[in-house]
Each structure stands twice: as C-alpha cells, then as structure tokens.
Interface confidence: medium
C-alpha cells in the first residue's frame, strides 16, 4: 500500500567524483509524506503524529512543508522557525519550497509544475518505488527514455553510475540517488565529504540532486569552522560520531 512505501531519504546535491576534483555526480531528492516509512541509516521509522519541528532551512522539513517563522512577517523574527505546511496552488509564495509538491513558485504564486517537462512528483515517485519487479513500468521520470529499463540490470548489483530504483539495486558502498532526471548508484559519503542535512523526512520536492548518506560511524553535521551568513548555504560534512 502507499503508506508502507520505503524511501531512501538521504538528500544530496553534489557528490565528489571518485577520482577527486570538484563537482560530481548529482541527482534530485525523494521525499515522503507523514505516515510513510523512511530509511534513516539502517532503521525504518514511522512519521505519524509528529509535532511542529524546529528548523533552520527548508531542507530540514518534509516534502509537504517549508521552514519559516510561525508568525507573519520575516522568517525567524521573534525566535524559532518551524516546519510549516506547504502552500497549495494559487497561494502566495516567496520560493519554491513554500509550494506543495507538484507546484513551484512563479511570480509570487504557487503554480502547477509543467509535468511534460519535469520529473514525476514525490507521491508518484513513491508509487514508482513500490512497483516491485515491474521495472519497465518504472522507467519513466516524466521524460520519455530512449531506452527502457529492463529487469536484466537488476540481476547483478549496479555499479557506480548505473541506473537504479532503490539502494538495494546498487553494489555495496553505493546508494541510489537522483541525478537530474534519473536515479543512479553513487558512493556512500566518506569522512570530510559534503553532505546534506535532513533531520526528518528528506528534502523538499524541489531538490534536483541527491547525495548519499554518510558511511558507517559518520554523521552529517555542520562544519564547525564554516561560518556562512546564509543558513541555506551552511556547509555540512560527514564527521565521526
């Protein structure tokens, strides 16, 4: 059923390439709605009946939320910011993350995404994740593919760069993460590598790139010596527990 979908919620933006250098292999994030299970490390947790959640940036909230001050006015004025319910279409907005999945912020108003040009929404993606062995049905990401995915690629674990549906399709040390309009196997992050912090449910619906989670014994934490003026630009790295 839809409320037993398992999703890898570790979001990434720019994965360092295996041979060093900048920039890397990206993808975009998968998020889930309340009540859906998600994979955090190796444990599966339920997100039902959650309380308002303090946050510093949109990425710490779920796909159906954004981070803002609960009162009207500038974000953060008068104290703590929390994850607020996303805004439905035709509601006012200031940025993409304020709009519910399937919408984006255009000229200050939440507008429906052009699905002929944009990958499937988060809920559709949850369905895709749960299609079981019907890999051909899962091949679409909102764009037609030149070649469809066939089940033969799942007979062996995917190597780095291989198309995947879920992390279990990938070889050891790799996770399945979005790269533009596809999902591919990417290396799990090592100590010191840049990671994206998501305290609960994954990223908002507008991530177009994903990073894998930090490897065993590592946690994604803000880099102590990295002070940025903007919350949204704070650098997190994989650090020893």
């Amino acid at each position: 059923t839809l409320n037993s979908v398992l999703i890898n919620s570790n979001a990434i933006k720019n994965l360092p390439p295996p041979l060093g250098g900048a920039g890397g292999q990206p993808g975009s994030a998968v998020s889930v709605a309340p009540g859906v299970l998600y994979e955090g490390g190796n444990k599966y947790q339920t997100l039902d009946n959650y309380q308002p959640y303090p946050c510093a940036e949109d990425e710490e909230c779920g796909s159906d939320e954004y981070c803002s001050s609960p009162s009207r006015g500038a974000a953060g004025v008068g104290g703590v910011q929390i994850c607020l319910a996303c805004r439905k279409r035709r509601k006012r907005c200031m940025r993409h993350a304020m709009c519910c999945p399937g919408n984006y912020c255009k000229n200050g108003i939440c507008m429906p995404s052009d699905h002929s040009h944009f990958p499937r929404g988060e809920i559709e993606e949850s369905i895709i994740e749960n299609l079981g062995n019907d890999h051909n049905a899962a091949a679409g990401d909102g764009y037609p593919r030149r070649t469809t995915l066939t089940s033969k690629i799942y007979h062996t674990k995917g190597q780095e760069g291989s198309v995947c549906l879920r992390s279990s399709d990938c070889a050891a040390g790799l996770c399945c993460a979005r790269h533009f309009w596809s999902k591919i196997c990417k290396p799990v992050l090592k100590e010191g590598q840049v990671c994206t912090k998501h305290k609960r449910k994954g990223s908002h619906g507008l991530e177009i790139f994903q990073r894998c989670y930090c490897g065993e014994g590592l946690a994604c934490r803000i880099q102590k010596d990295h002070h940025q003026a903007s919350n949204s630009s704070r650098l997190h790295t994989c650090q020893r527990h």
Partner: antibody, heavy 116, light 112 residues
Framework: QVQLVESGGGLVQPGGSLRLSCAAS????????MSWVRQAPGKGLEWVSV????????YYADSVKGRFTISRDNSKNTLYLQMNSLRAEDTAVYYC?????????WGQGTLVTVSS | DIALTQPASVSGSPGQSITISCTGT?????????VSWYQQHPGKAPKLMIY???NRPSGVSNRFSGSKSGNTASLTISGLQAEDEADYYC???????????FGGGTKLTVLG
C-alpha cells in the same frame, strides 16, 4: 588527470550536417553524465544537450531539439553530437563537459561555422 | 533565451576586491542553492571556480568566494591580480523544464 578533447568541427553550409566527437580520459567515463555547451563568437555560454551515464536519458535545449542528437560509446570513452539541419545561428565553439551539478571539467572546444 | 543577468563589465586595481552579481528569479537561481561560477580566459575553455553557491574546487585560490541572497548570487574576488582578468559566468538551473542556464558573462578588467 581528467582530459576531454573535442574534434569534428569545421565549415558547413546551412542545412548541412556535422558530427562532433569528444574523447575522454583520466576518469571513469561510464559513471558520468556528459553535456555539450556552446559559445557563439563573442557571446556567452549556452547549454546544448546532456546524456546520462548509460545513455538511457538524453535532453536538449529548445534551440536544438529535433535537429541535434547526443550519444556516447562508453567502450570507447567517447561522447558524440550529431548536428543536422544546421543554421547560421549554430555557429559556435562547441565544448564537451563532464556534468555534475556543475560542469566540472571542459574540453578545449571545436569551432563549427555554418555559412554559405 | 532565458539567461541570468550579470553586469557586462567590472574593473578593479590590483589588490582590491571586486564583486560580480548574478540575478535570476524565484524560478531559477532563487529557487535553488545550485549556483556555479566559471572563469574563461580569451581563447580558452571555461574553468569551474565556485560550486554549490560558495564551495571552491581544489586548486582554486581562496581569494575567490561565492554567496547568494534571494534571487541574486555574487562572486567576490579579493586581492585582485592581473591573471584574474577574464570573463566570468554564473550558472544555475531553470525549474520547468529543469535545464542548466548561464548568465550573460562579465568581463573583469584589472587596471594598471
């Protein structure tokens, strides 16, 4: 180190065709998405097309859709751009680039001139 | 063509700091933290200088830094040197369809 070398540029008449190649070395080519980016003389950069690591996904800028085809041969570590129905406005230096979120490595470019 | 807006030119003297702006909308640059900056010397290929708004690739001088506020990203070069004279391009993504988009470029002139 990472190296990308384009070839195949030249002078072609409007309506003609040309195939560009980009030979990659110094990294695991089959693991990376790759793009073509062009730059008209004296102008800025314009993204043209991108292809996924396994060729299953290809995307194009509106300005070249239906005329250009991106492809790759991972066994040869080579990226291609087949350009058909060329127009004067396609005149540019064409760069291949390794495409992460950003374009982290670029070739030196190959000049395509469309003129009668 | 959709493009991010950059000043056509900026200039500064050696040792000074300069900032190049890159303005988009909430549908592109403002909607993401994916902003990159490239340096291009005449007749050469572009070189990545900043990625993810404010991160430097290894080998890029710490005189180069990036930031973003709202729909505007900025590249700051401190302690300007003669070899910094080049064209600089910002790059982000449009939302529908998702596709890379570049700024029009800024010519940096180092005076003297």
């Amino acid at each position: 180190q990472v190296q990308l070398v384009e070839s195949g540029g030249g002078l072609v008449q409007p309506g003609g065709s040309l195939r560009l190649s980009c030979a990659a070395s110094g990294f695991t080519f089959s693991s990376y998405w790759m793009s073509w980016v062009r730059q008209a003389p004296g102008k800025g950069l314009e993204w043209v097309s991108v292809i996924s690591s396994d060729s299953s996904s290809t995307y194009y800028a509106d300005s070249v859709k239906g005329r250009f085809t991106i492809s790759r041969d991972n066994s040869k570590n080579t990226l291609y751009l087949q350009m058909n129905s060329l127009r004067a406005e396609d005149t540019a230096v064409y760069y291949c680039a390794r495409h992460g979120i950003d374009f982290d490595h670029w070739g030196q470019g190959t000049l395509v001139t469309v003129s009668s | 063509d959709i493009a991010l807006t950059q000043p056509a030119s900026v200039s500064g003297s050696p040792g000074q700091s300069i900032t190049i702006s890159c303005t988009g909308t909430s549908s592109d640059l403002g909607g993401y933290n994916y902003v990159s900056w490239y340096q291009q010397h005449p007749g050469k290929a572009p070189k990545l200088m900043i990625y993810d708004v404010n991160n430097r690739p290894s080998g890029v001088s710490n005189r180069f830094s990036g930031s973003k506020s709202g729909n505007t990203a900025s590249l700051t070069i401190s302690g300007l040197q003669a070899e910094d004279e080049a064209d600089y391009y910002c790059q982000s993504y449009t939302y529908t369809p998702i596709s890379p988009v570049f700024g029009g470029g800024t010519k940096l002139t180092v005076l003297g």
